[in-house]
């Protein structure tokens, strides 16, 4: 039977090394066996390159294309082939369809003044355009109470967030994750980072306990929990 595309390719670029296109066929398809996505930069002398797609679902194909460090002027010609049959043809400008890389290495540390310090890494090297363009969203949620969650927008440069322990329930286990976007590129959000989990030990003032003592104890507790969490 004839091969048809149900949802045409939608593509995003991390604006440093990879562009990813995804599309849906009208019936279950062995993407790598039946289809090829050719791509070519609209630039004098550029060669044609071929991407072998993989299945994301029965009828959904995805292709990851290595690209050079992207610049605004880059435009790619894309052609989706089933053998000799051209199924779809289009163009793709990475700078207009940015999906940032996922922030990495999210960690939580007890900090002075009864706060938690959340830290993560900017996924771009300093020389990349996006390094200084990223803002972040941090999601903090109570592992045992779906209603207890907070969202923090980090619009300043440093990939850190200070969180007052008093804003979280004492004795509860919390998870945090972070994602990024680039406002000047009108990007989509990145994928969420893997979650990191910690126990929030905070005693209200009226308990007359030394909070610094509690935080010192929490450092030990947190290290034990974090060690346990990452080995299971």
């Amino acid at each position: 039977g004839s091969v048809k595309v149900l949802h045409e390719p939608s593509c995003f670029s991390d604006y440093i090394s990879t562009s990813v296109c995804q599309w849906k066929m009208d019936h279950p398809t062995n993407c790598s066996a039946e289809l090829r996505l050719s791509y070519q930069l609209d630039f004098m002398g550029s060669e044609n390159h071929t991407c072998v797609p993989e299945n994301r679902e029965d009828s959904v194909c995805v292709c990851s294309m290595p690209i050079d460090d992207a610049v605004e002027a880059d435009v790619y010609q894309l052609d989706l082939w089933a053998g000799q049959q051209l199924l779809w043809s289009g163009s793709f400008q990475p700078s207009k369809h940015v999906k940032p890389r996922t922030p990495g290495n999210l960690t939580v540390h007890p900090n002075i003044s009864h706060t938690w310090l959340l830290m993560w890494t900017n996924p771009y090297p300093t020389e990349n355009h996006l390094h200084s363009e990223l803002t972040y969203m941090v999601n903090v949620s109570n592992d045992n109470d779906p209603e207890d969650f907070k969202v923090y927008n980090v619009t300043y440069m440093g990939p850190t967030l200070r969180l007052a322990a008093s804003t979280l329930k004492s004795g509860a286990s919390y998870s945090a994750r972070v994602r990024a976007w680039a406002q000047t590129y009108n990007s989509t959000w990145s994928d969420w980072s893997p979650s990191t989990t910690w126990l929030n030990y905070y005693e209200p003032w009226e308990q007359h306990l030394g909070l610094n003592d509690i935080f010192e104890a929490q450092k030990i507790e947190w290290h034990e929990h974090h060690h346990h969490h990452h080995h299971h």
Epitope: M44, G45, E47, N48, H49, I67, V71, E72
Partner: antibody, heavy 125, light 112 residues
């Protein structure tokens, strides 16, 4: 050492044909686009044609489009220019030159970084 | 097609002085920041051309630092400082971004 040696230049009558060759050595020929440039007696340089490293993409100046064909044989490290329907105004020294690196997604550009010694084509009755 | 216009078409300079040649394109040659697809070539009588500057300001291998290129967009300049007798020849600019590629008319540099 990079070397480009052109050959095939000759005296030919108007309407005739000629094939120029350019043998390359000293670099990875298949990785680079190649270009032909000509220079009429006492005149300036005129760009003619470019071919990508694989040979899959070709470009031409309007003055030669439809009459000249650029090609390459990467196994022989040789660039060609097939010239048909020659005219008196095609009389010139023809140079081959190494152009951009095309094995990368966006070609890396160094200008025409090495030129051959040229071969003379004379079109006259 | 893109028109490349060089000025002046001839230039006479004394040894030790600075020579300056301008090249203007009818279309921008800037692909992205720092990537200006404009080259400069020199040709001596009876010889093949040789590359001096590529991407607007990058010196080709083995080229003296007396040769410098500048500019962006559609306006570019080649400067030759402390001119020597051996610098005599014809200088060409060439755009390497848009097909068809093209050269300027050439500037003949004469050393007094």
């Amino acid at each position: 050492e990079v070397q480009l040696v052109e050959s095939g230049g000759d005296l030919v009558k108007p309407g005739g044909s000629l094939r120029l060759s350019c043998v390359a050595s000293g670099f990875t020929f298949r990785d680079y686009a190649m270009t032909w440039v000509r220079q009429a007696p006492g005149k300036g340089l005129q760009w003619l044609s470019l071919i990508s490293g694989s040979g899959g993409k070709t470009y031409y100046a309007d003055a030669v489009k439809g009459r000249f064909t650029i090609s390459r044989d990467n196994a022989k490290n040789t660039l060609y220019l097939q010239m048909n329907s020659l005219r008196a105004e095609d009389t010139a020294v023809y140079y081959c030159a190494v152009d951009r690196l095309t094995k990368t997604i966006r070609p890396q550009y160094y200008g025409l970084w090495h030129w051959g010694q040229g071969t003379l084509v004379t079109v006259s009755s | 097609d893109i028109v490349m216009t060089q000025t002046p078409l001839s230039l006479s300079v004394s040894p030790g002085e600075t020579a300056s040649i301008s090249c203007r394109s009818s279309k921008s040659l800037t692909y992205s920041i720092g990537y200006n697809y404009l080259d400069w070539y020199m040709q001596k009588p009876g010889q093949s051309p040789q590359g001096l500057i590529y991407l607007g300001s990058k010196r080709a291998s083995g080229v003296s630092d007396r040769f410098s290129g500048s500019g962006s967009g559609a306006d570019f300049t080649l400067k030759i400082s402390r001119v020597e007798a051996d610098d005599a020849g014809v200088y060409y600019c060439m755009q390497g971004l848009h097909s068809p590629l093209g050269f300027g008319q050439g500037t003949k540099l004469e050393i007094k």
